[in-house]
């Protein structure tokens, strides 16, 4: 057993039909030494007598809030929560597994830029009864300082007949160097309570693989003089870093039919212009890659030949 | 990445071209290693990111772009001592610390080149016969090297008496490549930048 | 003490369906996950499917995937495995089984694919 | 379709000390618990070993699991003609889980 915050702690247990559980001795807080009582949650039946009460805690039946009181006076709370061990796995099953880019994914994160700031988010279909917190580190053995704040619903969705919500939070590495080469990765841990069950996951990345950039901004089309060409040119993104000589982008023009069957043109390029031809129907869209370390592609900035 | 590469033309900062080549062939030993090695820890999850440049040589503070000097979390560092330029800066705009980190690039690629050279030594005694390093690699270090043209002390190739540990060679070589592809990527934006300046 | 009783094996020709059940008792049946496990004759042992405690997540062995579903009632405390399509080489003793470090075992049901 | 390895088969007269192994790779028994089943003729497997070396109440001591990196393996010191069966491993793979990896199991002959 072990306190997750003040007055509320996490009991562990190995989990399968008929384990023995983990015997908790639980102690009110209070100077009283006679007359205390213990009840669990909202039932008014006594459950022992005295400061510390024993409890073999085996299901979630018996998890919840133990209070003491003496004379109708509440004296003190704790509450337990249990995180289920199956065999030598810790449970998951607040969070949906995003499977992307590999099984066992609960939580995904991404950068915009090198500035130290990122984003995480998770899934669910638990609506109600859920809280999360969220710590962050760069390494684990002598960590320095990540900022996150709280965890927010940022979507829902309907897939079949689930309702599914998505979670997120942002970071802030404290004192982060855009150039810097990263040795240890960043650690983000979050806790998951719903209901009377506890369960905690965690990401380990380095900045580096996590950069997806904003889609190219500004994108043009000037049609050259006597020709089906024409000049693509676009601009970096405002949220990428600088300088851009430094944190170079390279990029992909698309040429794409109204018909998703129809044959694509690409070119890759490390400039910010580009000639391409514009078929009728067609549009033009440019996504960028960070040129010298292969991380995600950028979403499309698309616009129509017409 | 398989991408169309654009040739510089000759006016251009003549190391660019090299740190691409750099960069694109120890990508492709990374790769290759990875495949090979498939029952090795060697991907970037599963290995020690060890710098064996670290207390050496302080490239990174020493080619920090002028934009980032006025973060305070990018200062730790910064050299300060003086090393006669290289031919690939033109003399006239030879800068103090530009010439600092061209030496830097240049220390960290002797210092990549020696322990990659002991490491092949060791992996042609392995009986396997598993992987061996990429000889254009090497060619590539050496050609951004010469490029770079610093007079240095040339270091000993480290030799060892006892015999190898195969295993251990082979999880040091991941190591290796994987920290060296990172100063790759760091070598590539100085380049880039300087070549814009 | 925890009990896993199996039901539901027979002969069947090939590409016809069988509904596999098994009724747990002596613990809280929906606090737990469960699996199915089979065993062809004169075989090792392979892993057919696990359910979720609630029933939210299925997995299955690619060899039975879109051909057997596995699925729970927790308020009748039973385990099913419904099998379509079935091959001759589906032939084994299935077992049902709890999830956890200590578990629990069916006494077996056997099920022949021939026509 | 097997990924945890097992010997075909052991032997051992009665009193000698007989192991099994498992052997497997870093994205399972490297990075998962190990369990050892016993199965008799005709009847459901029995766990024996759970959590790489911990044993449920009721198996006698003389069994006893161990792990080390990749590769598991099972002990019977003091094998008895009764411990004649077939014994198999498992494990999970952290890719699939909660899909259950098997050995290829190995048939224990006690001799004499």
């Known amino acids: 057993i072990w306190e997750l915050k003040k007055d509320v702690y996490v009991v562990e247990l190995d989990w399968y039909p008929d384990a023995p559980g983990e015997m908790v001795v639980l102690t009110c807080d209070t100077p009283e030494e006679d007359g205390i009582t213990w009840t669990l949650d909202q039932s008014s039946e006594v459950l022992g007598s005295g400061k510390t009460l024993t409890i073999q805690v085996k299901e979630f039946g018996d998890a919840g809030q133990y209070t003491c009181h003496k004379g109708g006076e509440v004296l003190s709370h704790s509450l337990l929560l249990l995180h289920k061990k199956e065999d030598g796995i810790w449970s998951t099953d607040i969070l949906k597994d995003q499977k992307e880019p590999k099984n066992k994914t609960f939580l995904r994160c991404e950068a915009k830029n090198y500035s130290g700031r990122f984003t995480c988010w998770w899934l669910t279909t638990i609506s109600t009864d859920l809280t999360f917190s969220v710590k962050s580190s760069r390494g684990s053995s002598d960590p320095q300082g990540v900022t996150c704040g709280a965890a927010t619903l940022s979507a829902e969705r309907v897939r079949g007949d689930n309702k599914e919500y998505e979670y997120s939070v942002e970071c802030q590495e404290d004192s982060a160097c855009p150039a810097a080469e990263e040795s240890l990765p960043i650690e983000v841990m979050v806790d998951a309570v719903h209901k009377l069950k506890y369960e905690n996951y965690t990401s380990s990345f380095f900045i580096r693989d996590i950069i997806k950039p904003d889609p190219p901004k500004n994108l043009q089309l000037k049609p050259l003089k006597n020709s089906r060409q024409v000049e693509v040119s676009w601009e970096y993104p405002d949220t990428w870093s600088t300088p851009h000589s430094y944190f170079s982008l390279t990029f992909c023009v698309q040429v794409q039919g109204k018909s998703k069957r129809e044959k694509k043109d690409r070119v890759f390029t490390d400039k910010t212009s580009a000639t391409v031809i514009c078929r009728k129907n067609a549009s033009i869209s440019v996504r960028a890659q960070d040129r010298y370390y292969s991380s995600s592609w950028s979403e499309w900035a698309s616009v129509p030949c017409s | 990445r398989n991408l169309p590469v654009a040739t510089p033309d000759p006016g251009m900062f003549p190391c660019l071209h090299h740190s691409q080549n750099l960069l694109r062939a120890v990508s492709n030993m990374l790769q290759k290693a990875r495949q090979t090695l498939e029952f090795y820890p060697c991907t970037s999850e599963e290995i020690d990111h060890e710098d064996i440049t670290k207390d050496k040589t302080s490239t990174v503070e020493a080619c920090l772009p002028l934009e980032l000097t006025k973060n305070e979390s990018c200062l730790n560092s910064r050299e300060t001592s003086f090393i006669t330029n290289g031919s690939c800066l033109a003399s006239r705009k030879t800068s103090f610390m530009m010439a600092l980190c061209l030496s830097s690039i240049y220390e960290d690629l002797k210092m990549y080149q020696v322990e990659f050279k002991t490491m092949n030594a060791k992996l042609l005694m392995d009986p396997k016969r598993q992987i061996f390093l990429d000889q254009n690699m090497l060619a590539v270090i050496d050609e951004l090297m010469q490029a770079l043209n610093f007079n240095s002390e040339t270091v000993p190739q480290k030799s060892s008496l006892e015999e190898p540990d195969f295993y251990k060679t082979k999880i040091k070589l991941c190591i290796l490549l994987h920290a060296f592809r990172i100063r790759a990527v760091t070598i590539d934006r100085v380049m880039s930048y300087l070549n814009a300046s | 003490q925890v009990q896993l009783v199996q039901s539901g094996g027979g002969v069947v020709q090939p590409g016809r369906s069988l509904r596999l059940s098994c009724a747990a008792s002596?613990?809280?049946?929906?606090?737990?996950?469960m699996h199915w496990v089979r065993q062809a004759p004169g075989k090792g042992l392979e892993w057919v499917a696990f359910?979720?405690?609630?029933?939210?997540?299925?997995y299955y062995a690619d060899s039975v995937k879109g051909r057997f579903t596995i699925s729970r009632d927790n308020s009748k405390n039973t385990l099913y495995l419904q099998m379509k399509s079935l091959r001759a080489e589906d032939t084994a003793v299935y077992y049902c089984?709890?999830?956890?470090?200590?578990?629990?075992w069916g006494q077996g049901t056997m099920v022949t694919v021939s026509s | 379709s097997y990924v945890l390895t097992q010997p075909p088969s052991v032997s051992g007269t009665p009193g000698q000390r007989v192991t099994i192994s498992c052997s497997g790779g870093?994205?399972?028994?490297?990075?998962?618990?190990v369990k050892w089943y016993q199965q008799l003729p005709g009847t459901a497997p029995k766990l024996l070993i759970y959590?790489?070396?911990q044993r449920p109440s009721g198996v006698p001591d003389r069994f006893s699991g161990s792990k080390s990196g990749t590769s598991a393996s099972l002990a019977i010191t003091g094998v008895q003609a009764e411990d004649e069966a077939d014994y198999y491993c498992?494990?999970?793979?952290?890719?699939?889980?909660?899909?259950?990896?098997f050995g290829t199991g190995t048939k224990v002959t006690v001799l004499g």
């Open positions: 089984k709890t999830h956890g470090s200590h578990d629990n």
């Open positions: 002596g613990f809280t049946f929906s606090s737990y996950g």
């Open positions: 359910i979720r405690y609630d029933g939210s997540n299925k």
């Open positions: 870093r994205s399972n028994i490297g990075s998962s618990t």
């Open positions: 959590g790489n070396d």
């Open positions: 498992q494990s999970y793979d952290r890719g699939t889980h909660p899909a259950l990896l």
